[in-house]
Amino acid sequence: IWELKKDVYVVELDWYPDAPGEMVVLTCDTPEEDGITWTLDQSSEVLGSGKTLTIQVKEFGDAGQYTCHKGGEVLSHSLLLLHKKEDGIWSTDILKDQKEPKNKTFLRCEAKNYSGRFTCWWLTTISTDLTFSVKSSRGSSDPQGVTCGAATLSAERVRGDNKEYEYSVECQEDSACPAAEESLPIEVMVDAVHKLKYENYTSSFFIRDIIKPDPPKNLQLKPLKNSRQVEVSWEYPDTWSTPHSYFSLTFCVQVQGKSKREKKDRVFTDKTSATVICRKNASISVRAQDRYYSSSWSEWASVPCS
Amino acid sequence: RNLPVATPDPGMFPCLHHSQNLLRAVSNMLQKARQTLEFYPCTSEEIDHEDITKDKTSTVEACLPLELTKNESCLNSRETSFITNGSCLASRKTSFMMALCLSSIYEDLKMYQVEFKTMNAKLLMDPKRQIFLDQNMLAVIDELMQALNFNSETVPQKSSLEEPDFYKTKIKLCILLHAFRIRAVTIDRVMSYLNAS
């Protein structure tokens, strides 16, 4: 048993039929010694008396809020949550496996630049009685500070008959140098509590590996005289690290016809302009990627050819 | 200002070209190592991230763009040693920090070159003959060092009498290639920045 936060405790249980469970000793937080009784939840049934209560925790019915009283007055509470281990593996019932980039990916994170700011998100099909708290650090043995905000519901999607809920959190490394070469990964830890069930999820990454620039901005077309060609120009996204001559991007320019089946013409360039042939009803799209470290491409920025 | 299209300083340009070749070569070599050593811990998640140049050079700090010198988090340990006369520098542009930066890059390359050559000698003794260092990568390191053209005493290649542990050597190769790729990215950024300045 360990303390998650004040008056909230997590009991780790091996979960199998007829498992013996864990013996837990609860202590009433009071200077009083006599006349103390214990109840579970809002029941009036007395479980025991005395300053300590010893219970055998086997299942969810044994979890909940234990309260010690004296003479009708509440002295203190202890909320017990359960963390299930089945076949040696901690349960992952609360979050959905996103399966990207690999199986057992519950948390996904992205950064728009090298400032040390990043966003993580996760999915669940549970919509009520759910709380998350997020901690993060650089390295684990001698951790350096990363500050995370509160997790918030960022999207709801319908997937067949089910609704899926996306939660996200923003974190910022306390003292980040954009030019630094990372040798210790960022660790992100999410505590998830659904009713009386506790689970924890972790992710470990280097900022350089989760970079995904915003799409290029100010995408413009300039027709060239007496030609079907156009000059496409764009700018670095505002959120990208500066100076741009140090944090350089490379770009992919694509001409795509109305039909998805039509052949796509693609050009790769380090410049912020390119000359392409604009077909009728086609659109021109540009996306960006770090020029020197191949992490994710940005989403496309697009303009119609007409 | 986005990627200036001004004509690059011819003195600087060879280094930019060589640094791009270097990054391409080390990336290819790392990919080859990951594929060939698929049953070894060779991915970024599996290896320990060691930097053989730690406490010996300070490339990141010495080569910090001016715009980032206001960021206190970037100013942990700026070196102040002074080495001059790199052929990548046109003399009129020579500056204290730039010379220090390029000499730090040169020292990095020299250290990695020695490590890679020593390692290759061990890998050539492996009866499995599973993996060797790409000669192109070693050549590209050499070319960039020549373009930087700093006078520095040569470091003798480490030789070892004992029978090498080939498993350990291959793990070390992965660690080295990951670290060198990260340093090659920094070198490329620096060259691009200097070329645009």
Partner: antibody
Framework: EVTLRESGPALVKPTQTLTLTCTFS??????????VSWIRQPPGKALEWLAH???????YYNPSLKSRLTISKDTSKNQVVLTMTNMDPVDTATYYC????????????WGQGTTVTVSS | SVVMTQSPDSLAVSLGERATINCKAS??????VAWFQQKPGQPPKLLIY???NRYTGVPDRFSGSGYGTDFTLTISSLQAEDVAVYYC?????????FGGGTKVEIK
């Protein structure tokens, strides 16, 4: 002893707004982990959950009725109020309030219910 | 929303015999299922929570089991006072939903 009691009009006209009050004793909505739900049961039919409010003001609604429902609490009066707009004869039912706590997450105490008929 | 399908709709059992009511969820609801008993003219009464935990004061002839999508309420030895309608309810996901009910009578 925990008790809950529902009150409100027995008859409402179609399109009118229904306001129901749940008055409770034996627990307080200022206590962490306490909540109150509203449930209804049309004559001879199954139960349907409508809305829930927690001690901290956080609330949940049945999505199919969300646009018509508002749940609120008055902690000092030990009351929870449910309003339902644009009433229709199909809303004729017995309306119950029930306590639901953060500890066993079950509706453990129910009121006796109040019958509401929607008719012109 | 999660549909809770109860079976059978009604059940006639001799006094002292076992009564079994099933409840099937349209998707996994973990163990977030409660069972209620409702007698005519009365509000529902909580019997079981977290699929298998008997609520305070509920006789031990009532037991619940199941996880995921399939749940069962068992009355091991039916008594005259057990004649009622029984409902399962999930609160894994909003909206919290009830089954259609199973009427238990004495044969």
């Amino acid at each position: 002893e925990v008790t809950l009691r529902e009150s409100g009009p027995a008859l409402v006209k179609p399109t009118q707004t229904l306001t129901l009050t749940c008055t409770f004793s034996g627990f307080s909505l200022s206590t962490s982990g306490m909540g109150v739900s509203w449930i209804r049961q049309p004559p001879g039919k199954a139960l349907e959950w409508l809305a829930h409010i927690w001690w901290d003001g956080d609330n949940y609604y049945n999505p199919s009725l969300k646009s018509r429902l508002t749940i609120s609490k008055d902690t000092s009066k030990n009351q929870v109020v449910l309003t339902m707009t644009n009433m229709d004869p199909v809303d004729t039912a017995t309306y119950y309030c029930a306590r639901r706590t953060r500890v066993n997450y079950a509706m453990d105490y129910w009121g006796q219910g109040t019958t509401v008929t929607v008719s012109s | 929303s999660v549909v809770m399908t109860q079976s059978p709709d009604s059940l006639a059992v001799s006094l002292g015999e076992r009564a079994t009511i099933n409840c099937k969820a349209s998707q996994s609801v973990s163990n977030d299922v409660a069972w209620f008993q409702q007698k005519p003219g009365q509000p529902p009464k909580l019997l079981i929570y977290y699929a298998s935990n008997r609520y305070t004061g509920v006789p031990d002839r009532f037991s619940g089991s199941g996880y995921g999508t399939d749940f069962t309420l068992t009355i091991s030895s039916l008594q005259a006072e057990d004649v009622a309608v029984y409902y399962c309810q999930q609160d894994y996901n909003s909206p919290w939903t009830f089954g259609g009910g199973t009427k238990v009578e004495i044969k």
